[in-house]
């Protein structure tokens, strides 16, 4: 059976072979992939990038979250979604994922001119069916899914909208473990509205494998804060294997090329 | 109170290596990073690396990645860098530090070590 | 890596006069500069985190401001135990640096 794919820390840390990100297959090795760094001066503004809409982001729920031997997940369900942003059609929230390491510099998969953050949070959302525009985009869409990204840092205060979620790691420690998170709504885990207005978009993948291309990625320039303890939870409470012996940290696939694509922003 | 207490100070010759130690009491070693700094005779500040005492995770200084290793003990709560060929500019002190706030300012420092390369 | 400046090299005073630093960063670092003192023979003391928030236990009379490229660190009124050495440090972007320090000394 081949191998199934894993992160570089779990390969270095585990007796179990895997393959790494230089191996993924699939889409993995193609020329529009995913995360890149964004050089802030050169991506270009465009007036058609306008503020999101949010549906259902305000709504208290109970999420699911479950470690799926990757990261962290909530489970959405098609209980959100978001319009405007420039995007052409409206999104449906399926899940919600982080990336991070235990040290500060090197969290994020995305950076900003060459600098990484703390951590990295992902909404994906995929597209309302029957909303593209033509034929071959409907057959071939690169606009399919949608991926809020937004960078983490530490600030000096605990974010209580992201209480929830840390307190429900502990109750997920093993992969294929899930729980139920306390009442929260999406947009508390949001910055403030007014940070969401600048952003920076491009054409990419999914950051795991098979990496499809299809991904239209929304990168916010404003980082969520966090307490340190709330992101040093997530490499202390959460491991990569059932024996726990190997923390989930450095869940972060690396930079690719941005070749020939261009990076917009608002 | 919050202390880090460094080992004391040491005279070796060229070529060897040493290894420094900074003993955390009064928080909990795990939840906060520790920090390096050099100081030579006379002279600024040069931050060396970082490590996270709960995983052992580190970050270097590209300047000092072949130079400096750092290594933390959870069970006596104490840091340690060791230093690898060793020359005279190496001669300096050495101070531990806690990070804060993850990423940010050093709250509290050791009293630093003071290391001499001579022959 | 992001550049940091003091000046000047060295301030003379007098005990009970006002006295400020400054710190100039290659770029704009928000508010993310901390400072330092150091005495003679001594370790660094947090006396400024955030170019202006205070410190527990620092004396009052030690005040910071600024923000994007230029920062002040100021003492309303000079008393002798703060002959020292005061370091800027940039925590913006990895690795953190430090200015080259601006001595205080007496008169």
């Known amino acids: 059976a081949e191998s199934h794919w894993c992160y570089e820390v779990q390969a270095e840390s585990s007796n179990y072979p895997c393959l790494v990100p230089v191996k993924w297959g699939g889409n993995c090795q193609k020329d529009r992939q995913s995360p890149i760094n964004i050089v802030t001066t050169k991506a270009k503004v465009d007036k058609k990038l306008g503020r999101f809409f949010f549906s259902g982001y305000d709504k208290k729920q109970t999420w699911t979250v479950q470690n799926n031997g990757h990261s962290v997940m909530m489970l959405l369900e098609n209980k959100a979604s978001i319009s405007g942003g420039g995007l052409p059609a409206p999104y449906q929230a399926k899940q919600l994922h982080l990336h991070w390491s235990d040290l500060p510099y090197k969290g994020s998969e995305h950076s900003l001119d060459g600098e990484h953050f703390a951590m990295e949070m992902h909404i994906v959302h995929e597209k309302e069916k029957g909303t593209s525009r033509n034929v071959k985009e409907a057959q071939d869409p690169e606009d399919e899914i949608a991926v809020l990204a937004f960078l983490v840092e530490a600030g000096t205060q605990v974010n209580e909208g992201f209480q929830p979620l840390v307190e429900a790691l502990s109750n997920i420690p093993k992969p294929e473990m899930s729980t139920t998170m306390a009442e929260s709504s999406l947009l508390d885990l949001l910055p403030k509205e007014e940070k969401l207005r600048h952003y920076f978009r491009y054409l990419g993948s999914l950051t795991t494998p098979t990496c499809d291309e299809k991904v239209v990625w929304t990168v916010f320039r404003e980082p969520i804060q966090l307490h340190r303890e709330q992101i040093l939870a997530f490499s202390q409470k959460l491991y990569y294997d059932k024996e726990q012996t190997v923390s989930m940290k450095d869940n972060v696939r690396p930079l690719q090329q941005l070749g020939q694509r261009t990076v917009i922003k608002s | 109170d919050v202390q880090l207490v460094e080992s004391g100070a040491e005279l070796v010759r060229p070529g060897t290596s040493m290894k420094m130690s900074c003993k955390a009491s009064?928080?909990?070693?795990?939840?906060?990073?520790i920090e390096w700094i050099k100081q030579r005779p006379g002279q600024g500040l040069e931050w060396i690396g970082v490590?996270?005492?709960?995983?052992?995770?580190?970050h270097y200084n590209e300047k000092f990645k072949d130079k400096a290793t750092l290594t933390a003990d959870k069970s006596s709560s104490t840091a340690y860098m060791q230093l690898s060929s060793l020359t005279s500019d190496d001669s300096a002190v050495y101070f531990c530090?806690?990070?804060?706030?993850?990423?940010?300012?050093?709250?509290?420092w050791g009293q630093g070590t003071t290391l001499t390369v001579s022959s | 890596q992001i550049q940091i400046t003091q000046s000047p090299a060295i301030l003379s005073v007098s005990p009970g006069e006002r006295v400020s630093f400054s710190c100039r960063a290659s770029?704009?670092?928000?508010?993310?500069i901390h400072w330092y003192q150091q005495r003679t023979n001594g370790s660094p003391r947090l006396l400024i985190k955030?170019?202006?928030e205070s410190i527990s236990g620092i004396p009052s009379r030690f005040s910071g401001s600024g923000s994007g490229t230029d920062f002040t660190l100021s003492i309303n009124s000079v008393e002798s135990e703060d002959i020292a050495v005061y370091y800027c440090?940039?925590?913006?972007?990895?690795?953190?640096?430090f200015g080259a320090g601006t001595k205080l000394e007496l008169k």
């Open positions: 530090a806690r990070e804060a706030d993850y990423g940010s300012r050093f709250d509290y």
């Open positions: 009064g928080y909990a070693f795990t939840n906060y990073l």
């Open positions: 490590i996270n005492p709960g995983s052992g995770g580190t």
């Open positions: 770029q704009s670092i928000g508010t993310r």
């Open positions: 955030y170019a202006s």
């Open positions: 440090q940039q925590s913006n972007s990895w690795p953190t640096t």
